[in-house]
């Protein structure tokens, strides 16, 4: 259960991936499209709201054991719009929600070195946002501590700007 | 309540090696990391390297590769800091510290040990 | 590295005085800057964490504010158990890092 209804923190960032290729949403036939791209130079990244909530985590949930206290993450590149986990067609898709934002929102949030970060399903331990075939997909990984496989790995970039402006 | 406790005051010649040792109750041990951090006397706090109790990964502040070695006894709840080839500029006090969150290495701590005294002097 | 400047280096203030430390990022961390307030011969102790939340069981008059590079602890009203050096530490980038502290004296 997340343990606070408000997140801890939030900020404004552009996502890349670990060879820094950029993740984009583009609006197509009323429904949002996620993509993996070489962005032109010139070209604005797109800006990701990233809501940080504390959350328990018991130890059965976990691949590796782990229980207590998990910073968890939401995405949200524009309003009222968040990346959920499809578990069942293992995909990662744009959908529209009201809060309390559905358990398949949140993913717990993994720091390698700190220069990269990973994204795991809340709703299925042991399974990670990735890149496959330019899109973003679900990846199972064999828990270890490396998460070492590259296309689950992804670069947060600060945007410095008030966080409104990003809706 | 969570409770981490270290071993007591050294005394240490140049070269030599020191391990300084935090016992951990209150919690389940090999779901926090545990960080070391230093600070010398009149000085501010330098962090030295964490260590995943459940699996003993470890990460080093590059100043310490090689001279550090950070272990955990999950047996004893118990994380060391081994450091050799001793100086007076590592006379310090050095504190252990544990993970706010599980499962991954934040950098926030919400835990801390009450600090070992560690002199190095001919 | 990140450098983290912290100022005053010191400060002289009364009881009942409100009292504004900041910490400077030298690049950008987000939100993920920490306080503590340390005592002679004791552990640091945490006040804040993620920039602005109140660690449980710390007193509502510290507040911290700020993200990004430029963050500020307020202490909104002084009291005698508060005589501290105060530092804060930013967990956004390896090595964690952490200003060169805040001495409050009494006046």
């Known amino acids: 259960s997340i343990t606070g209804i408000s997140p801890i923190t939030e900020s404004l960032a552009s996502l890349s991936t670990y060879n820094d290729q950029s993740i984009t949403f583009a609006l197509e036939d009323e429904s949002y499209e996620i993509y993996v791209e070489d962005l032109k130079k010139d070209k604005k990244k797109d800006k990701v709201l990233l809501s940080y909530y504390e959350s328990q985590h018991p130890s059965s949930e976990s691949g590796d054991g782990v229980d207590g206290k998990m910073l968890m993450v939401t995405l949200s590149p524009t309003k009222d719009f968040w990346l959920q986990a499809n578990n069942k067609e293992h995909s990662v898709e744009l959908h529209k929600c009201e809060k309390p934002l559905p358990d398949q929102a949140f993913f717990v949030l993994h720091n390698r070195s700190f220069n990269c970060v990973s994204f795991e399903c809340k709703t299925d331990p042991g399974v990670f946002i990735g890149v496959k075939d330019n899109h973003l997909a679900l990846i199972k990984v064999d828990y270890s501590e490396n998460l070492g496989s590259e296309n689950i790995l992804f670069k947060l970039s600060e945007i410095l700007e008030h966080h409104h402006h990003h809706h | 309540q969570v409770q981490l406790v270290q071993s007591g005051a050294e005394v240490k010649k140049p070269g030599a090696s020191v391990k300084v040792s935090c016992k951990a109750s209150g919690y389940t041990f090999t779901s926090y990391g545990i960080s070391w951090v230093r600070q010398a006397p009149g000085q501010g706090l330098e962090w030295m390297g964490w260590?995943?109790?459940?699996?003993?990964?470890?990460n080093y502040a590059q100043k310490f590769q090689g001279r550090v070695t950070m272990t955990t006894d999950t047996s004893t709840n118990t994380a060391y800091m081994e450091l050799r080839t001793l100086n007076s500029d590592d006379t310090a006090v050095y504190y252990c510290a544990r993970d706010r969150y599980s499962g991954s290495f934040h950098g926030n701590f919400d835990y801390w040990g009450q600090g070992t005294l560690v002199t190095v002097s001919s | 590295d990140i450098q983290m400047t912290q100022s005053p280096s010191s400060v002289s203030a009364s009881v009942g005085d409100r009292v504004t430390i900041t910490c400077r990022a030298s690049q950008g961390i987000f939100s993920w800057l920490a306080w503590y307030q340390q005592k002679p011969g004791k552990a640091p102790k945490v006040l804040i964490y993620?920039?602005?939340n109140l660690e449980s069981g710390v007193p509502s008059r510290f507040s911290g504010s700020g993200s990004g590079t430029d963050f500020t602890l307020t202490i909104s009203s002084l009291q005698p158990e508060d005589f501290a050096t105060y530092y804060c530490q930013q967990a956004n980038s390896l090595p964690l890092t952490f200003g060169g502290g805040t001495k409050v004296e009494i006046k």
């Open positions: 260590i995943r109790a459940y699996n003993g990964y470890t």
């Open positions: 993620a920039a602005s």
